[in-house]
């Protein structure tokens, strides 16, 4: 799997999108997990609603939310109040039974300032010899969520 870099700004919210084939993954719940070390397990952070038909409902675990557009085939994860220690390698997963298919590998990068990232033209895309193959960098520098957009109280 290729790895996509999503760059966010400390203190703000970051939206990560994971596109998938809606027919292939029809009826499957999704999850967002954090990789523990290079070869370690992927620790579940949050998963979509237990009832697949309600996957569009946003579910929260702490400052992380997940919602699934099952028709359009896009899983969206929101990391609220992003902090440097949130940086790391994550995965979007499609669940079936006790198994999980990786939809996308995501490297979350937390920048100190929205002006600190390079322009897309300056970004380096590593070749196949590098550990992250055919990397794609998403400048998901986004504003903080407005108060009214945050479900209160957050449900997990």
């Amino acid at each position: 799997h290729n790895t996509t870099v999503f760059q966010g700004v400390a203190g703000q919210s970051l939206q990560v999108s994971c596109p998938y084939d809606s027919m292939k993954h029809w009826g499957r719940r999704k999850a967002w997990c954090r990789q523990l070390g290079e070869k370690g397990p992927c620790q579940r952070v949050v998963s979509t609603h237990n009832l697949w038909l309600l996957s569009f409902l946003r579910r929260w675990n702490g400052s992380t939310a997940i919602t699934d557009d099952t028709l359009g085939g896009t899983l969206t994860i929101t990391l609220r109040n992003l902090q440097p220690h949130d940086a790391g390698l994550y995965q979007c997963q499609s669940l079936h039974g006790s198994e999980a298919d990786t939809l996308r590998k995501v490297l979350v990068e937390v920048l100190a300032d929205p002006l600190d990232h390079r322009d897309a033209g300056d970004l380096w895309f590593p070749g196949e010899s590098e550990s992250f193959e055919d990397a794609h960098v998403e400048h998901s520098i986004s504003r903080s969520l407005l108060e009214g957009e945050i479900p209160f109280p957050p449900t997990s």
Partner: antibody
Framework: EVQLQQSGPVLVKPGASVKMSCKAS????????MNWVKQSHGKSLEWIGT????????SYNQKFKGKATLTVDKSSSTAYMELNSLTSEASAVYYC?????????????WGQGTSVTVSS | DIVMTQSHKFMSTSVGDRVSITCKAS??????VAWYQQKPGQSPKLLIY???TRHTGVPDRFTGSGSGTDFTLTISNVQSEDLAEYFC?????????FGGGTKLEIK
């Protein structure tokens, strides 16, 4: 064995600029952030900034923004820091340090330091 | 900026003793705290990260604890080679900041 080999000591005049290097070996350069830390004589440590050689992402300590510029050359696994408009306050030892992409980790390897003396 | 305060600039101990070095953050930093050891004339070395995880190769007499705002580095069975300055650092939020350091003196 992980090694961060830094360039030698420099003596510069006030107002001048200096560019120091940090050559990494013993690991995959693009898999780790490179940080720079300042240690003034007999004092504590100050984080200057970090650069991700993989994505090009850079974060600076606001205190050093406009004063320090971080770059990398992936082909030679070398990180650089340029300091401009130097004053006596910039006299210090500067360390490059490696940090895992995972935000739960700290700066696990340090270079031997580059001593900068600003004097007329 | 988060201020990391190491209240003791110097601490004196004897070989074989147990010593605790403390560090206080000006606001909650969760467990995003590291401890470094710097021996005279050398670069700092990582001892502990994520408040309590020992870095590879660090002797188990070094133990880190704490979360939120109060953190402790404990050295049990102090050895003469532990003569050094110890710094705490938070990496919970930008800019990353260090404590002022605690110099450990061996009696």
């Amino acid at each position: 064995e992980v090694q961060l080999q830094q360039s030698g000591p420099v003596l510069v005049k006030p107002g001048a600029s200096v560019k120091m290097s940090c050559k990494a070996s013993g690991y995959k350069f693009t898999d780790y952030y490179m940080n720079w830390v300042k240690q003034s004589h007999g004092k504590s440590l100050e984080w200057i900034g970090t650069i991700n050689p993989y994505s090009g992402g850079i974060s600076y300590n606001q205190k050093f923004k406009g004063k320090a510029t971080l770059t990398v050359d992936k082909s030679s696994s070398t990180a650089y820091m340029e300091l401009n408009s130097l004053t006596s306050e910039a006299s210090a030892v500067y360390y490059c340090t490696r940090r895992n992409w995972d935000g739960r980790y700290a700066m696990d390897y340090w270079g031997q330091g580059t001593s900068v003396t600003v004097s007329s | 900026d988060i201020v990391m305060t190491q209240s003791h600039k110097f601490m004196s101990t004897s070989v074989g003793d147990r010593v605790s070095i403390t560090c206080k953050a000006s606001q909650d930093v969760s467990t995003a705290v590291a401890w470094y050891q710097q021996k005279p004339g050398q670069s700092p070395k990582l001892l502990i990260y994520w408040a309590s995880t020992r870095h590879t190769g660090v002797p188990d007499r070094f133990t880190g604890s704490g979360s939120g705002t109060d953190f402790t580095l404990t050295i049990s069975n102090v050895q003469s080679e532990d003569l050094a300055e110890y710094f705490c650092q938070q990496y919970s939020s930008y800019p990353f900041t260090f404590g002022g350091g605690t110099k450990l003196e061996i009696k």
